[in-house]
């Protein structure tokens, strides 16, 4: 028998520095977690203690904090090289800055293979990107070899900016021939490493003949055997065992997100490459594991540029950006409009001639808007200003909801109106009219939504049975501010870009902004 230790991360999303327990900015260092300096300590310890170790990343290193905003992926290459990752799969967010924003900072700089079998380049890009990412890689580990085959969510064109010269094929269809090729090369230990979410990970384990282990990402799935060490609730045991169509037991793993855990899976193979046993658990990277002082010193060196960036002007406003709770929790506020407009702008994807865009709607809890921005400071808007407006380090995500769920969400928005509560929704691509004289749960008297399957966008009544795409904060997607109906009834959820980054990019693009209060939210009674 031959034993392999698989260490794995996924959806790190730019958390290079240690974070608080909820993966936001670290405040009390003695209770902080994760970060590359701490990850390094643990990885090195395991490498020293065990003979056959692979360190793998299942994608979405890009996007999530000011680190990515400023360094644009150079930080990912540098610190992943420093940690000596053995392989990485491409995630959807790796395309957030276009193909060039992937090629230059990461693909050309990484000292480890970057993989995806289901992304095919065409046209002029094919020769430019050739060899910079691979469908698979055979890695020597001790006296053996292990094949790693990569995959990426085929939804990436809707979630990011891969451009028109990359084709995202069905994962299973693309993986099978690559695995078969590895088998012909006498590679009998094969790991599928990818970024399509837990459901697809399980399907790959079931359907792709020859895959021994699946290491996934995208869905931020937390798996654990025994009592979990922090706040995350396990979606199943670690590893999650799938019985393949040809009768094999295939372990499937994922390690939550944000570098909070290091996945740790031990696999025992027989001499023919069959999995005999698998066991392990994610390791919580808490403060019982010190940050390596040398990696920490490197982080501190890179940090200097971030501090300078946060005070630089992104653009100007010529109007007061009303982000006060007195406005945003009671009525349409222009800060809410600005943020929603930025959220839609960030999701412009012309992937189908029938649609002007795949999504037109935005909802945003008023309680998530934490500060106004005064235009009388020469109109200057900085990252620091935006961090005061959006201090929670969330993301603006894409969900699919039925019209009936949206209607419930808008009823919840005003079910206890007048108490300055955070659930009052700011909107984009939506016209809503409330009648507060009616009883809670029956106050939405008009709800029109902007069409997507149209050449000239216009507002049409919401259809209860239709499925709509909506951009919203991850906080709402997870049922925050009482929006349990969104969490319970959403049909799809893909995590998006860092909230501040979305707004800052929009302001930089527009250069001068002047958002108005324009009648997106109305009240049908005269007193409002």
């Amino acid at each position: 028998a031959w034993e392999l230790t698989i260490l794995h991360t996924n959806d790190v999303h730019s958390r290079l520095e240690q974070t608080s327990e909820d993966s936001s900015k670290c405040v009390n260092a003695s209770r902080c977690m994760g970060g590359v300096a701490r990850l390094f300590t643990k990885v090195q310890q395991i490498r020293r203690a065990e003979p056959n170790v692979l360190l793998l990343d299942a994608g979405d290193q890009y996007q999530g904090t000011i680190w990515f905003t400023v360094y644009k992926g150079a930080e990912v290459a540098h610190f992943m090289n420093a940690l000596r990752y053995d392989a990485m799969a491409l995630g959807n967010h790796e395309f957030d800055n276009g193909v060039e924003g992937l090629i230059e900072p990461l693909l050309k700089e990484a000292k480890f293979p970057i993989l995806s079998a289901n992304i095919k380049a065409k046209g002029p890009l094919a020769s430019q990107i050739s060899g910079l990412y691979l469908p698979y890689k055979v890695l020597p580990v001790g006296d053996e070899v292990v094949g790693i085959v990569g995959y990426t969510s085929k939804e990436t064109p809707f979630l990011s900016n891969p451009g028109t010269n990359l084709v995202f094929e069905d994962e299973i269809t693309a993986l099978q021939p690559e695995v078969d090729k590895l088998k012909t090369l006498n590679v009998n230990k094969i790991i599928a490493l990818g970024h399509s979410g837990f459901e697809m990970d399980k399907l790959i384990a079931q359907k792709v003949r020859g895959v021994d282990v699946v290491v996934g990402g995208h869905s931020n799935t937390f798996l654990y055997t025994g009592n979990p060490p922090s706040k995350e609730v396990p979606a199943g045991k670690y590893p999650f065992i799938v019985t393949s169509d040809d009768g094999r037991k295939v372990p499937v793993v994922q390690a939550y997100a944000f570098g909070k855990y290091l996945g740790y899976l031990k696999i025992e193979f027989d001499e023919r490459g069959n999995v005999i046993s698998s066991h392990g658990n994610p390791i919580l990277l808490n403060s019982s594991i010190p940050e390596d002082p040398s990696i920490k010193a490197d982080i501190n060196k890179w940090r200097i540029k971030l501090d300078n960036y946060s005070t630089q002007e992104l653009g100007k406003t010529i109007v007061y950006l009303d982000g006060s709770s007195q406005s945003c929790r009671f009525r349409e506020c222009n800060m809410g409009n600005l943020i929603c407009d930025a959220m839609i702008n960030n999701n412009l994807r012309h992937t189908d001639e029938m649609f002007w865009n795949h999504v037109s709607m935005c909802i945003l809890n008023g309680g998530g808007i934490r500060s106004p921005i005064d235009e009388r400071n020469n109109g200057t808007i900085t990252w620091e200003n935006l961090a005061a407006v959006l201090p929670f380090g969330g993301t603006f995500d894409l969900v699919q909801l039925k019209g009936s769920t949206l209607k419930k969400a808008f009823e919840h928005s005003v079910h206890r109106y007048g108490q300055s509560t955070g659930e009052f929704l700011q909107v984009g691509g939506i016209h809503v009219v409330y009648d507060l004289s009616r009883k809670p749960g029956d106050r939405v008297v008009k709800l029109d939504v902007l069409c997507t399957k149209c050449r000239v966008p216009s507002y049409d009544p919401l259809k209860m049975d239709e499925v709509y795409k909506v951009i919203l904060p991850n906080f709402l997607a997870n049922g925050g501010d009482g929006f349990q109906m969104i969490k319970d009834e959403l049909l799809r959820h893909d995590s998006g870009d860092q909230d501040i980054n979305v707004v800052s990019t929009y302001i930089s693009k527009m250069k001068v902004i002047y958002p108005a209060v324009e009648g997106r939210i109305k009240f049908s009674t005269g007193s409002h």
Partner: antibody
Framework: QVQLQQSGAELMKPGASVKISCKAT????????IEWVKQRPGHGLEWIGE????????NYNEKFKGKATFTADTSSNTAYMQLSSLTSEDSAVYYC??????????????WGQGTSVTVSS | DIVLTQSPASLAVSLGQRATISCRAS??????????MNWFQQKPGQPPKLLIY???NQGSGVPARFSGSGSGTDFSLNIHPMEEDDTAMYFC?????????FGSGTKLEIK
């Protein structure tokens, strides 16, 4: 067992450069930091900096930036430190040491025997 | 940078007696409940040898008569009973943060 074998003593002219080697045996070279330390009589021990060979990460003491350059060759398990623009201030014994990680505690657990560099015209 | 101040600069102790060397850091070298303070012994013509790591843990093959204590900014190395072979220079060193720094050293002799 773990051993660090350094190159022999050097007598150099001012303005020249010298490259000191440190060959590691008895452990996985790429997994441990190599530290470089300077010792001049009456000046105690001074940390110059470090290199992690497998990952080729370096950290330098600000005082030695531009003076010392670290490299490593994982095929021969050898770390190198080059000292440039030598002056009499660089006359010292230079040590390489492995930074251990027993319980994460980052102590220099094994040392080379030292390389004496004398700068004289 | 963290400055380490060692005292005394030199010390003479009778065989069989206790030798105590102190090291004070300009700021705490504690982190994560660990004191990142190490002690080295150096004899003439030889490289330093690790005696104590993390304030109180003995290095490999170090005799039990060497012990370390302290936390935060104040640390001490104790040698008891003093033996002939213990004549040497002793250095403290912090590994909490880069740049790593050493104390100026204490010369220990037999009285």
């Amino acid at each position: 067992q773990v051993q660090l074998q350094q190159s022999g003593a050097e007598l150099m002219k001012p303005g020249a450069s010298v490259k000191i080697s440190c060959k590691a045996t008895g452990y996985t070279f790429s997994n441990y930091w190599i530290e470089w330390v300077k010792q001049r009589p009456g000046h105690g021990l001074e940390w110059i900096g470090e290199i992690l060979p497998g990952n080729v990460i370096t950290n330098y003491n600000e005082k030695f930036k531009g003076k010392a350059t670290f490299t490593a060759d994982t095929s021969s398990n050898t770390a190198y430190m080059q000292l440039s623009s030598l002056t009499s201030e660089d006359s010292a014994v230079y040590y390489c040491a492995r930074r251990g990680d027993d319980g994460y505690l980052y102590a220099m657990d094994y040392w080379g025997q030292g390389t004496s560099v004398t700068v004289s015209s | 940078d963290i400055v380490l101040t060692q005292s005394p600069a030199s010390l003479a102790v009778s065989l069989g007696q206790r030798a105590t060397i102190s090291c004070r850091a300009s700021e705490s070298v504690d982190n994560y409940g660990i004191s990142f303070m190490n002690w080295f012994q150096q004899k003439p013509g030889q490289p330093p040898k690790l005696l104590i790591y993390a304030a109180s843990n003995q290095g490999s093959g170090v005799p039990a008569r060497f012990s370390g204590s302290g936390s935060g900014t104040d640390f001490s190395l104790n040698i008891h009973p003093m033996e002939e072979d213990d004549t040497a220079m002793y250095f403290c060193q912090q590994s909490k943060e880069v740049p790593f720094t050493f104390g100026s050293g204490t010369k220990l002799e037999i009285k």
